[in-house]
């Protein structure tokens, strides 16, 4: 059978239960429910999942049983709408329940909250966690799925199953170790950081599909898969793109059972045909399903075939360019993108998409001109500035990162972005700028050939975080413009923003700059966030402050914190020295 050509099933829920198995079925339904109803208590979700699972089992036993022929959206939506406190907890989301499918599911999707009002996850003591793990492993792991899914409503569900498997393995190993904490904590830190990155990457895929459409996502996928599988034929890449688009459309649309099932099929197809796809897949394909799918998604680029011909001959010099373009525009542009991308693993995907867009725009214009060939003959010259712009930007910023180190590089970006878009909330500016700053440690260590794909594609992910957070509470026309005009030009759009001259500085509030002894017990990371929050507020009060002025104030602030944390009476020190610091800072900044 073809990868996604299944016979029609009398009962969709029975079909997915049988394909996925009970354990994965239950986990995926829990993720789906937690991503939709993000405020519901864990116990309520477990109850709903158990009810759905029992129902699925009746359908497996008899596909003709009552309601077994209903769609998954109908079954799941009906179940979600039985929640008694829907109106009190979710307000207008309860109105979704008055709608029929497919409108009801679309309504639920629109109410997913990228920044839900949930308490920060606090990690208990290792012994407490190990006891909970041993007492009830199943509940412990379900709780992990629930807590991640409700905080990350677009997390890639089959990948979350992979994280849960690693989470379980970490506890299984480390709770038996001599030094439990030394074994477990680094593993949990790694899972947390990888999880945040995975969530953000998937959020960009969903935004691409939902805000810019399937064609935009497919173009991204053609470019990325052509870089990764440069020896594969265009038709092979096209087939993988079509299947991958289906998988992500399903997951982004809340169809998690179908998504996980189709992702498994795609991994199976790739491994069965790896000789035609990539020489780098062998190790991945020897792994169990969840590891295999993850491994394929992260696999390194295959080597480029030797002696690839010049692209100019057929895409610029040929007299048949317009004829070929007119015959099948998207196939021709797809081939252009495929051929360009497989030759350029050193370019970011977004750069490749800018080049393809430039090529398309040129052909649209020139193929209607009197002398098309004369008109499009210099199209490759137009690529040069597009390539040089990210190259120069990365070079400059990596030099700055190497000079400053991560924390101070983040601070430079905090100042830069607060001046560009001062209306954005301080927590969002801190979170986004900190993540932008991580590009330094993540990418600047790479050789030139790997820097751009690492840096610019990572920045696309981070700027999408800004876009989705800003969309919830729009405050800046400039952010809206950069986020909505062009997916591939978001980063250049933000880079091009200058200081917002229309911004009226924020009123000074001493409370914002009042600190207490509790700062002394914070982790280094939390302390940095406190200082960076103060820095953003400073810039919002004094957007025209120079780097030197801001540096002086921040240095004084760091010295103040260090001094008071060493004092015998910390709270008194913070109160008295804090007043002096505020006064000195106001004077230094002319507030």
């Amino acid at each position: 059978r073809g990868v996604f050509r299944r016979d029609a099933h009398k009962s969709e829920v029975a079909h997915r239960f049988k394909d996925l198995g009970e354990e994965n079925f239950k986990a995926l339904v829990l993720i789906a429910f937690a991503q939709y109803l993000q405020q519901c208590p864990f116990e309520d979700h477990v109850k709903l999942v158990n009810e759905v699972t029992e129902f699925a089992k009746t359908c497996v036993a008899d596909e003709s049983a009552e309601n077994c022929d209903k769609s998954l959206h109908t079954l799941f939506g009906d179940k979600l709408c039985t929640v008694a406190t829907l109106r009190e907890t979710y307000g207008e989301m309860a109105d979704c329940c008055a709608k029929q499918e497919p409108e009801r599911n679309e309504c639920f999707l629109q109410h997913k909250d990228d920044n839900p009002n949930l308490p920060r996850l606090v990690r208990p003591e290792v012994d407490v966690m190990c006891t909970a793990f041993h007492d009830n492993e199943e509940t412990f792991l379900k709780k992990y799925l629930y807590e991640i899914a409700r905080r990350h409503p677009y997390f890639y569900a089959p990948e979350l199953l992979f994280f849960a498997k690693r989470y379980k393995a970490a506890f299984t190993e480390c709770c038996q170790a001599a030094d439990k904490a030394a074994c477990l904590l680094p593993k949990l830190d790694e899972l947390r950081d990888e999880g945040k990155a995975s969530s953000a990457k998937q959020r960009l895929k969903c935004a691409s599909l939902q805000k810019f459409g399937e064609r935009a996502f497919k173009a991204w996928a053609v470019a990325r898969l052509s870089q990764r599988f440069p020896k594969a034929e265009f038709a092979e890449v096209s087939k993988l793109v079509t299947d991958l688009t289906k998988v992500h459309t399903e997951c982004c649309h809340g169809d998690l059972l179908e998504c996980a099932d189709d992702r498994a099929d795609l991994a199976k197809y790739i491994c069965e045909n790896q000789d035609s796809i990539s020489s780098k897949l062998k190790e991945c394909c020897e792994k169990p399903l969840l590891e295999k799918s993850h491994c394929i998604a992260e696999v390194e680029n295959d080597e480029m075939p030797a002696d690839l011909p010049s692209l100019a001959a057929d895409f610029v010099e040929s007299k048949d360019v317009c004829k070929n373009y007119a015959e099948a525009k998207d196939v021709f542009l797809g081939m252009f993108l495929y051929e360009y991308a497989r030759r350029h693993p050193d370019y970011s995907v977004v750069l490749l998409l800018r080049l393809a867009k430039t090529y398309e725009t040129t052909l649209e214009k020139c193929c209607a001109a009197a002398d098309p060939h004369e008109c499009y003959a210099k199209v490759f010259d137009e690529f040069k500035p597009l390539v040089e712009e990210p190259q120069n930007l990365i070079k400059q910023n990596c030099e700055l990162f190497e000079q400053l180190g991560e924390y101070k590089f983040q601070n430079a970006l905090l100042v830069r972005y607060t001046k560009k878009v001062p209306q954005v909330s301080t927590p969002t500016l801190v979170e986004v700028s900190r993540n932008l700053g991580k590009v330094g440690s993540k990418c600047c260590k790479h050789p030139e050939a790997k820097r751009m794909p690492c840096a610019e594609d990572y920045l696309s992910v981070v700027l999408n975080q800004l876009c989705v957070l800003h969309e919830k509470t729009p405050v800046s026309d400039r952010v809206t413009k950069c986020c909505t005009e062009s997916l591939v030009n978001r980063r250049p759009c933000f880079s091009a923003l200058e200081v917002d001259e229309t911004y009226v500085p924020k009123e000074f509030n001493a409370e914002t700059f009042t600190f207490h002894a509790d700062i002394c017990t914070l982790s280094e990371k939390e302390r940095q966030i406190k200082k960076q929050t103060a820095l953003v507020e400073l810039v919002k009060h004094k957007p025209k402050a120079t780097k030197e002025q801001l540096k002086a104030v921040m240095d004084d602030f760091a010295a103040f914190v260090e001094k008071c944390c060493k004092a015998d009476d910390k709270e008194t020190c913070f109160a008295e020295e804090g007043k002096k610091l505020v006064a000195a800072s106001q004077a230094a900044l002319g507030l």
């Epitope: 034929e233 038709a235 087939k239 692209l311 004829k323 196939v331 081939m335």
Partner: nanobody, 125 residues
């Protein structure tokens, strides 16, 4: 819509060389992916090599890499397969095929839409 005509087959000694050609006529956009397949007696048809007439990328099955070279002359709408270091196991009827680049895959003959009649290549001493 599209006609493909192979030529150049014949008898050649092991270690020898041969060039087969395929002339295409009709709507050539429909032939922007072209390939060579072969079928030995009692065996399934297998992909040998393919080329995109836009972009010029080439693909080979493992058993012929380094020995066979596919090329095309767009101005003449002709496809070539230069076969060097021929072996007895290369004996087969060689078919020219064409299709859309969005569909054609060398490992799957059903993804090619148009076929020639074939030309026999015999490698024997």
């Amino acid at each position: 819509e599209v006609q493909l005509l192979e030529s150049g087959g014949g008898l050649v000694q092991p270690g020898g060389s041969l060039r087969v050609s395929c002339a295409a006529s009709g709507n050539t956009y429909l032939t922007s992916c072209m390939g060579w397949f072969r079928q030995a007696p009692g065996k399934e048809r297998e992909g040998v090599s393919s080329i995109y007439t836009v972009g010029g990328s080439t693909f080979y099955t493992n058993s012929v890499k380094g020995r066979f070279t596919i090329s095309r002359d767009n101005s003449k709408n002709t496809l070539y397969l230069q076969m060097n270091s021929l072996r007895a196991e290369d004996t087969a009827v060689y078919y020219c095929a064409a299709g859309s680049p969005a569909r054609c895959r060398l490992r799957d003959p059903t993804t090619f839409d148009y076929w020639g009649q074939g030309t026999l290549v015999t490698v024997s001493s």
